[in-house]
Interface confidence: low
């Protein structure tokens, strides 16, 4: 339905508060280096303009597209050339090339200072002094660091952030009330950002068909009682929402997401019995709740899949008539029967089925050719099952920190060219799969573990894409979305790697390590471990363990010393010499 003024339409649909918040998110995700005050000024100008269009949709410029309006506004930033370099060239382009140009310059790893949390009293004072600015600052800081954060979901985070301060700044023990809530929001926010990044990568790098396949599988697992036509409708709508958000169309995205939540709740009887509680919540909570809702129970007495997809004489006829629809039905039927499989496994099975039909439907006797197709699934199912079993056993034996270290060594040997901070970040996140998923019963382990690993490996892929250094990473990241994890799992030690020259500076530590949190201290040690492996890729587990144990003892000793700095200087030299000897450097 065409509107005379798109900006007026969205302003009316979303309301002023959400409109302003979403425009701020959009601008911060595009111009990640701009100061907060500059963005607030731009947002206020856009909002005032939108209000004139609401009053009179025929007013000058009100008929322009949102990309044109927003792009024109971003291109008024005076320091664009010196702050962003070649991104300023985007402003010479016309829409929609200009918007695509801005999208291509989004930086997954912007050079921004780490967010340091002020004292609780300082935060509470700032919150009380100017609540609106305080919350806008939160949106701005998250959006600029996470340029693909799912905008309507960020509004939900901001609502929880506000609620935490409203409650805790009145509490007797403000810190005890507030800090755990902020920690939870930070961790959930990072997870939410990474999950959305995978959705955008899926759409942008592998196309809409890949995303739709993922959505069919996931929604069929979640809503196994819904019929195929219903799942297809939800997939189409969900694809539109994520295409918009990933494309920077945040107002349309938030509006369409609200419409989708409304539709789901109005039709929950034909979708899922688990939606009742979600649908009683306010909009932001409702959308979040639906996105996280547990799988509905599988219908009783589902017939065998083989009847329609192997035994039927019409398989090739049905496939030829509407390939994607038939494959979609296969994926739907398989996924609703297998909540115990990861989405990526289901997609591998569907791909195998598609490849088999492509080959067999051209054969002399198609039925004879594809009769054993389900037998080809067995090794595909067993591979992740065995991998998860082995890794959960290792996790239970080592605990999270040492399990992360095992993965650090494993991945540094596979792709030693990758930067140390990236290897540490990715391996730490890979290692979290243990505490996240190994506690689950068998039936929930694979969807938890393998789909989580897909999210983490996508982080590696997007960070590596910015500065590609390893052909092996590029190959695993670009060849197949669903086979990324098996591709990385299959990598052996990179025999072509020339070990990094030893640099004592890398292993020089100071007394500041003693005041770090346990997490920060772990990261320091894990950074040293990666560097060790880069110097000595053929080092054995035992050698590395010995050096790391010495290192832990060294830090503990010097942090207890009276003159810490002298201890770090003197003992550090001894440690470096001993480590070199132990590793034969």
């Amino acid at each position: 339905d065409a509107h005379k003024s798109e900006v007026a339409h969205r302003f009316k649909d979303l309301g002023e508060e959400n409109f302003k918040a979403l425009v701020l998110i959009a601008f911060a995700q595009y111009l990640q280096q701009c100061p907060f005050e500059d963005h607030v000024k731009l947002v206020n100008e856009v909002t005032e303009f939108a209000k004139t269009c609401v009053a009179d949709e025929s007013a000058e410029n009100c008929d322009k597209s949102l990309h044109t309006l927003f792009g024109d506004k971003l291109c008024t930033v005076a320091t664009l050339r010196e702050t962003y370099g070649e991104m300023a060239d985007c402003c010479a382009k016309q829409e929609p090339e200009r918007n695509e140009c801005f999208l291509q310059h989004k930086d997954d790893n912007p050079n921004l200072p780490r967010l340091v949390r002020p004292e609780v009293d300082v935060m509470c004072t700032a919150f009380h002094d100017n609540e609106e600015t305080f919350l806008k600052k939160y949106l701005y800081e998250i959006a600029r660091r996470h340029p693909y954060f799912y905008a309507p979901e960020l509004l939900f985070f901001a609502k929880r952030y506000k609620a935490a301060f409203t409650e805790c700044c009145q509490a007797a023990d403000k810190a005890a009330c507030l800090l755990p809530k902020l920690d939870e929001l930070r961790d959930e926010g990072k997870a939410s950002s990474a999950k959305q990044r995978l959705k955008c990568a899926s759409l942008q790098k592998f196309g809409e068909r890949a995303f739709k396949a993922w959505a069919v599988a996931r929604l069929s697992q979640r809503f196994p009682k819904a019929e195929f036509a219903e799942v297809s409708k939800l997939v189409t709508d969900l694809t539109k929402v994520h295409t918009e958000c990933c494309h920077g169309d945040l107002l349309e995205c938030a509006d369409d997401r609200a419409d989708l939540a409304k539709y789901i709740c109005e039709n929950q009887d034909s979708i899922s019995s688990k939606l009742k509680e979600c649908c009683e919540k306010p909009l932001l909570e409702k959308s979040h709740c639906i996105a996280e809702v547990e799988n509905d129970e599988m219908p009783a007495d589902l017939p065998s899949l083989a009847a329609d997809f192997v035994e039927s004489k019409d398989v090739c006829k049905n496939y030829a008539e509407a390939k994607d629809v038939f494959l979609g039905m296969f994926l739907y039927e398989y996924a609703r029967r297998h909540p115990d499989y990861s989405v990526v496994l289901l997609l591998r099975l569907a791909k195998t089925y598609e490849t088999t039909l492509e080959k067999c439907c051209a054969a002399a006797d198609p039925h004879e050719c594809y009769a054993k197709v389900f037998d080809e699934f067995k090794p595909l199912v067993e591979e992740p099952q065995n991998l998860i079993k082995q890794n959960c056993e290792l996790f239970e034996q080592l605990g999270e920190y040492k399990f992360q270290n095992a993965l650090l060594v494993r991945y540094t040997k596979k792709v030693p060219q990758v930067s140390t901070p990236t290897l540490v970040e990715v391996s730490r996140n890979l290692g979290k799969v243990g505490s996240k998923c190994c506690k689950h019963p068998e039936a929930k382990r694979m969807p938890c573990a393998e789909d989580y690993l897909s999210v983490v490996l996508n982080q590696l892929c997007v960070l590596h894409e910015k500065t590609p250094v390893s052909d092996r990473v590029t190959k695993c990241c670009t060849e197949s979305l669903v086979n990324r994890r098996p591709c990385f799992s299959a990598l052996e030690v990179d025999e072509t790697y020339v070990p990094k020259e030893f640099n004592a500076e890398t292993f020089t530590f100071h007394a500041d390590i003693c005041t770090l949190s346990e997490k920060e201290r772990q990261i320091k040690k894990q950074t040293a471990l990666v560097e060790l492996v880069k110097h000595k890729p053929k080092a054995t587990k035992e050698q590395l363990k010995a050096v790391m144990d010495d290192f832990a003892a060294f830090v503990e000793k010097c942090c207890k010393a009276d003159d810490k700095e002298t201890c770090f200087a003197e003992e550090g030299k001894k440690l470096v010499a001993a480590s070199q000897a132990a590793l034969g450097l």
């Epitope: 829409e95 929609p96 918007n99 291509q104 809409e208 068909r209 694809t239 539109k240 494309h247 994607d324």
Partner: nanobody, 123 residues
């Protein structure tokens, strides 16, 4: 009313070149991904190439990679298909199609279709 009109088809010798054009009207051209599909006599319609609404992303079928190039001119509401090193197996009716959202997808994801233009590669 939305119209997609293909032109530029014809008879060409193996190894030769052709440039197909598709002029769109009745839609906001820059809001649509565009694609070319083809159908040889007695065969399924197959996806050849598609391009995103701003031209930033393209998809090519393996059979045409390195030989065919898709481009678009949003100011002229036109999408082009430059076909080089043509082979007899490229003989088909070529259809232009428009999709509201960028897809590398199948024909089901395209909303509007042209009538087609015939390309014959023969010596």
């Amino acid at each position: 009313e939305v119209q997609l009109v293909e032109s530029g088809g014809g008879v060409v010798q193996p190894g030769g070149s052709l440039r197909l054009s598709c002029a769109a009207s009745g839609l906001t051209f820059s809001s649509y991904a565009m694609g070319w599909f083809r159908q040889a006599p007695g065969k399924e319609r197959e996806r050849v190439v598609s391009i995103s609404r701003g031209g930033g992303y393209t998809y090519y079928a393996d059979s045409v990679k390195g030989r065919f190039t898709i481009s678009r001119d949003n100011s002229k509401n036109t999408v082009y298909l430059q076909m080089n090193s043509l082979r007899p197996e490229d003989t088909a009716t070529y259809y232009c199609a428009a999709a509201r959202y960028w897809a590398t997808g199948s024909e089901y994801e395209f909303d509007y279709w042209g009538q087609g233009t015939l390309v014959t590669v023969s010596s």
